[in-house]
């Protein structure tokens, strides 16, 4: 069965996905969809990486890892309950039939009312979007961005300072996925499978 | 219009090889997975192979692996299906068909070649 | 493998009536079905895709539905034309398998 991710509408959700590549810069092709993981492909590809770059992408699917070194978790921005569902990170390694395929179960919760707003620092502040010009973008033209190195010691540091929000399981949840030395539990919310 | 023609087939020994191949035309070919499926005279339907837009990926019904190979050449918008070894109970009709596209979605064999004849008989 | 099983193996039907053709499959393959029609001496015809839509200039009386692993194909108010075998096929796991085929003749 899927492994099951949480987020509440409003959120950024995050669903991990990696691998190792080669060399450096010896990448592989990576599809995101939304719905299982067919035999081929991604069902409805949101987004899509080739030997280089991001090459296709769709609003609010982005990838805040660098995917130059593996990381291809994608980042859903501002979900709705209508996000919820399974979404499949095909890592497209070429061979006779050597894809990687991982089914990761969404389960989007409505907001909780929350009595007064807590100053937290923005997501999106501190894991930039990726930005990029190749490939078979949809309408909308976007221009070139850099990715910033954020480090595990970064990652640790924002969630401290996050801790009481919901967003910092996420970003706890980020460093432990980086780390991946085992598979990991946070919470009863979230259960986390290091696929590579 | 997107058209699938596939090479003609024959009668070979048992044995030896055969190459098919299969011209694209109507629409752009490595933007598709494509597949050859073949089919025993007055009998279903069987999957033989898959190849992703680029050759890179090949995909093949694990008992026709060590002898059937897929490749596409891009440039000439041709795919092809390399048969060694053949056996008698691959004679049948060999058809192409284009699969699934650069941006999903659409899972099915949208199109299909006329397809070739190839009996293997002594 | 995923083994698709197709009933029934054969339907006698006249012109006008309604028939259901149903494919279970072995294990869950979500909606990545498809339904193909194949007339005799012709080349298979994609009807329907992802279990229920319907595939570019494919009559209206023709519909998919089911997910999962229960399956069926619909023609509404039969036609000469529609006469001939029809295959379902699951696009989730590998090997592509196909089922065994339903041929629909004209009682």
């Known amino acids: 069965s899927e492994v099951e991710y949480r987020a509440e509408v409003g959120q950024n959700a995050y669903l991990p996905c990696f691998y190792t590549p080669a060399a450096p810069g010896n990448l592989v092709p990576v599809c995101w969809g939304k719905g299982a993981c067919p035999v081929f492909e991604c069902g409805n590809v949101v987004l899509r990486t080739d030997e280089r770059d991001v090459n296709y992408w769709t609003s609010r699917y982005w990838l805040n890892g660098d995917f130059r070194k593996g990381d291809v978790s994608l980042t859903i921005e501002n979900v709705t309950l209508a996000d919820s569902g399974i979404y499949c990170c095909r890592i497209q390694i070429p061979g006779i039939m050597n894809d990687e395929k991982f089914n990761l179960k969404l389960v989007i919760k409505p907001a909780k009312v929350t009595p007064a707003p807590t100053r937290q620092r923005d997501f999106t502040a501190a894991f930039p979007r990726m930005l990029t010009t190749r490939g078979h973008g949809p309408a909308e033209t976007q221009t070139l961005g850099s990715l910033p190195d954020i480090n595990l010691t970064q990652i640790s540091t924002l969630a401290n300072e996050l801790r009481d929000s919901r967003l910092a399981n996420d970003l706890r949840d980020s460093g432990a996925t980086i780390r991946g030395s085992s598979d990991y539990k946070d919470d009863d919310d979230k259960h986390h499978h290091h696929h590579h | 219009e997107v058209k699938l023609v596939e090479s003609e087939g024959g009668l070979v020994q048992p044995g030896s090889s055969m190459k098919l191949s299969c011209t694209a035309s109507?629409?752009?070919?490595?933007?598709?997975?494509m597949a050859w499926v073949r089919q025993v005279p007055e009998k279903g339907l069987e999957w033989v192979a898959n190849?992703?837009?680029?050759?890179?990926?090949?995909y093949y019904l694990d008992s026709l692996k060590s002898r059937f190979i897929i490749s596409r050449d891009n440039a000439k918008n041709i795919l092809y299906l390399q048969m060694n070894s053949l056996k008698s109970d691959d004679t049948a009709t060999y058809y192409c068909?284009?699969?699934?596209?650069?941006?999903?979605?659409?899972?099915?064999?949208?199109?299909w070649g006329q397809g070739t004849l190839v009996t293997v008989s002594a | 493998d995923i083994q698709m099983t197709q009933s029934p193996a054969s339907l006698s039907a006249s012109v006008g009536e309604t028939v259901t053709i149903t494919c279970r499959a072995s294990?869950?393959?979500?909606?990545?079905l498809a339904w193909y029609q194949q007339k005799q001496g012709k080349s298979p015809q994609l009807l329907v895709y992802?279990?229920?839509t319907l595939a570019e200039g494919v009559p209206s009386r023709f519909s998919g539905s089911g997910s999962g692993t229960q399956f069926s194909l619909k023609i509404n108010s039969l036609q000469p034309e529609d006469f001939g075998s029809y295959y379902c096929?699951?696009?989730?796991?590998?090997?592509?398998?196909f089922g065994a085929g339903t041929k629909l003749e004209l009682k």
């Open positions: 109507g629409f752009t070919f490595s933007d598709y997975y």
């Open positions: 294990d869950n393959i979500y909606s990545y």
């Open positions: 190849i992703n837009y680029d050759g890179s990926s090949t």
């Open positions: 096929q699951q696009h989730y796991g590998s090997p592509l398998t």
């Open positions: 992802n279990a229920k």
């Open positions: 068909a284009r699969d699934v596209g650069y941006y999903g979605g659409n899972y099915g064999f949208a199109y």
